[in-house]
Interface confidence: medium
Amino acid sequence: MMTGTIETTGNISAEKGGSIILQCHLSSTTAQVTQVNWEQQDQLLAICNADLGWHISPSFKDRVAPGPGLGLTLQSLTVNDTGEYFCIYHTYPDGTYTGRIFLEVLESSVAEHGARF
């Protein structure tokens, strides 16, 4: 039975050219996290594997930094980065938990950041 829940940074906005931290947190379960995938729509951004550590997808290697923690830092944001991001926690024995974050990248110099935890 999957008892865990994922908390995320929710809906967030950031300024074009700036950076943003995407974070998820898995709670209410004692399951072991074996791997976390970060995906944008159907595109893999990064993997954090318990055995092998962090690996960033080649297409994003100049703009994505691992961390903090199991989170992901997006840099040099463009308007095209607007969209849904998913943190996918692979756990044992529970299975897979998925969190969703919506990022809006604004042309304006005023960007309201969503709540952090």
């Epitope: 993997i47 594997n49 055995d51 092998l52 690996h55 960033i56 997808s57 080649p58 297409s59 290697k61």
Partner: antibody
């Protein structure tokens, strides 16, 4: 110590089938990809394909798709490369190698020499 | 299909710097790796993810990758560095390709 040990040299006739093996030890076999690389006599390295033994996800180079089959048996930490009908042009040294995600092949087998001649 | 191009040969005097290039369309958007192969031996990884050195590889080996070109640099080249060198690139689908190889000759 990480080791990839390949099966011994083979001499075959055109049209025959063949399956060569690569046994991994000293690491978590299901956490890394295993790739196969061909090197024809006096020539360069050619990437054939790769398998993730954890779930048998397999990718092939377009040049080798349909020509060979890559498989793995995680219960015995062994990857395989097989042909259903060998050709003389398959004569080459075949290497298996281990990779983690986008890292390069960090450990290699000793190679298996396959000779196909009538 | 994707292709990587390397010079067939590069010569360098002992103690000097050798640079081996590898070119491919938008190669800088992929991860480049470099392998050293000596006669009769299996290849050895010397650089991965553009510029990272595996443990046991001497500091004189370094790499870079941007635009359409990846470069393997060997500073203070030694006689034992004489070998064939191959570049390789992977994309996000884990499809991969090798360059044609470069024979490095250490003069003298």
């Amino acid at each position: 110590e990480v080791q990839l040990v390949q099966s011994g040299a083979e001499v075959k006739k055109p049209g025959e089938s063949l399956k060569i093996s690569c046994k991994g030890s000293g690491y978590s076999f299901t956490s890394y990809w295993i790739g196969w690389v061909r090197q024809m006599p006096g020539k360069g390295l050619e990437w054939m394909g790769i398998i993730y033994p954890g779930d048998s996800d397999t990718r092939y180079s377009p040049s080798f798709q349909g020509q060979v089959t890559i498989s793995a048996d995680k219960s015995i930490s062994t990857a395989y490369l097989q042909w259903s009908s060998l050709k003389a042009s398959d004569t080459a040294m075949y290497y298996c190698a281990r990779a983690a995600w986008w890292q390069g092949f960090d450990h290699w087998g000793q190679g298996t020499l396959v000779t196909v001649s009538s | 299909s994707y292709e990587l191009t390397q010079p067939p040969s590069v010569s360098v005097a002992p103690g000097q710097t050798a640079r081996i290039t590898c070119s491919g369309d938008a190669l800088g958007d992929k991860y480049a790796s470099w392998y050293q192969q000596k006669p009769g031996q299996a290849p050895v990884l010397v650089i991965y993810e553009d510029s990272k050195r595996p443990s046991g590889i001497p500091e004189r080996f370094s790499g870079s990758n941007s635009g359409n070109t990846a470069t393997l640099t060997i500073s203070g080249t030694q006689a034992e560095d004489e070998a064939d060198y191959y570049c390789s690139a992977k994309d996000a689908s884990f499809n991969s390709v090798f360059g044609g190889g470069t024979k490095l000759t250490v003069l003298g």
